[in-house]
């Protein structure tokens, strides 16, 4: 990948990821550099007849490194200060190559949840306000409320009536995803008005 | 039917500022989220960031913090843009565009051109 | 952020031809959206979560792909297809679109 414009990779959180090294063909390779975020992470001398030297330079992610037989970095255990932008020098005997990546740290979705705040009308409507959540959401994380295949929110909150005289049994489904993970939760709209209707009764009595 | 009606045509001397409006009507306003993008005179479309219409909070992408505001006002369904401090460089359609989810921009405001010159 | 790099950014042809329309990510993405934007028009949605054809398009469009490479495929051009077609992704902030291909009448 040309210097100019990074290969992006997406990692998985506590996972391991690969940053793939591709050698000028032909070309006897003197070393090789990693970087990372302009720091030095390894130094590599190949050797034909014996395993290469390799010199780890940064100690933090140290113990999680490791080299395939291309020299392309893996990274194991993956945390998310691991976010950033990883260089790759390739020096031979008349040039030097530079390979540039992006690493994107992602987190698998978790504990998903929903949160109900309805009441019930006089006229026996129940307006649901449901908010729906999972574990460290940011700001990559898409939410949705589905209905018979409908999208009726994409927000995390969705509103909606129900009025139990005139609706059939209705499930909500809340999705949550991102680019490496999804999760549903659904709520049923009568188990929900029901609850709200006892609470609304024993208020009453 | 669902639409998103925008306010017209701005003319504005650099350092003025403008209040972009985006109206809603055909569905519960707040359950969908509200995005704004910029088209710049013959360029590309550019995402602006968003604001979710039920929490009022916005989003805004690197290159529109600071100079740009998303609003609503849910009485009246309508979000708005404003944008301080008008550069040249501002001048641009800009567009309302309500997400279905997973950032499908299913409705488009008809957009709004800002022209910024003294 | 992700760049979507689409090509070929002119694609001249003549109705009834085939249009393959590609969109490259820089980086793996869950799912492609396109819309289609005529001069002096709002862009109009045309094709979500890869394949999935808005509300009203006609069946001539189809939409395929994953990871990094998506296509919009014409099977047969007709004239209210010649426009500019954008693609766009929701997989990380920010929602980035691709620079466009215009479909030209050759």
């Known amino acids: 990948q040309s210097s100019l414009t990074p290969l992006m990779v997406n990692g998985i959180l506590g996972e391991s990821v690969t940053l793939p090294l591709e050698f000028p063909a032909g070309e006897k390779v003197n070393f090789i550099t990693w970087l990372f975020n302009e720091t030095s992470l390894a130094f590599i001398v190949p050797h034909e007849t014996k395993s290469p030297e390799i010199h780890v330079t940064n100690p933090k992610q140290g113990k999680r490194l490791n080299f395939t037989q291309s020299y392309s970095l893996q990274l194991s255990n993956l945390k998310m200060e691991d976010t950033g932008s990883y260089r790759a020098q390739i020096s031979t005997k008349t040039s030097a190559k530079l390979s540039s990546y992006t690493l994107r740290i992602l987190r698998q979705l978790r504990n998903i949840q929903v949160t109900n705040h309805s009441q019930l009308f006089q006229n026996m409507t129940c307006e649901l306000h449901l908010t729906c959540s999972v574990e460290d959401a940011d700001d990559n994380v898409s939410f949705r409320w589905e209905a018979l295949g409908n999208t009726l929110s994409s927000q995390p909150n969705l509103t909606v009536s129900w009025d139990p005289r005139i609706s059939s049994e209705q499930d909500y489904t809340c999705i949550a995803e991102n680019a490496v993970s999804n999760l549903s939760f659904s709520v049923s709209a009568q188990k929900l008005c029901e609850d709200v209707k006892i609470q609304y009764t024993d208020t009453k009595m | 039917q669902i639409q998103l009606v925008q306010s017209g045509s701005e003319l504005k001397k650099p350092g003025a500022s403008v209040k972009v409006s985006c109206k809603a009507s055909g569905y519960t306003f707040t359950n969908y989220g509200m995005n704004w993008v910029r088209q710049a005179p013959g360029q590309d479309l550019k995402w602006m960031g968003w604001i979710n219409t039920y929490s009022g909070e916005p989003r805004y992408a690197d290159d529109f913090k600071g100079r740009f505001v998303f609003s609503l006002d849910k009485s009246v369904n309508t979000a708005y843009l404003q944008i301080s401090s008008l550069k040249a460089e501002d001048t641009a359609v800009y567009y309302c565009?309500?997400?279905?989810?997973?950032?499908?921009?299913?409705?488009w405001g008809q957009g709004t051109t800002v022209t910024v010159s003294s | 952020q992700i760049v979507l790099s689409q090509s070929p950014a002119t694609l001249s042809l003549s109705p009834g031809e085939r249009a393959t329309l590609s969109c490259r990510a820089s980086?793996?993405?869950?799912?492609m959206h396109w819309y289609q934007q005529k001069p002096g028009q709002a862009p109009r949605p045309w094709i979500y979560a890869t394949s999935n054809l808005a509300s009203g398009i006609p069946a001539r469009f189809s939409g395929s792909g994953s990871g990094t490479d998506y296509t919009l495929t014409i099977s047969s051009l007709e004239p209210e297809d010649f426009a500019v077609y954008y693609c766009q992704q929701w997989s990380s902030t920010p929602r980035t679109f691709g620079g466009g291909t215009k479909v030209e009448i050759k």
């Open positions: 980086s793996s993405v869950s799912h």
């Open positions: 565009a309500r997400d279905y989810g997973r950032w499908y921009f299913d409705v």
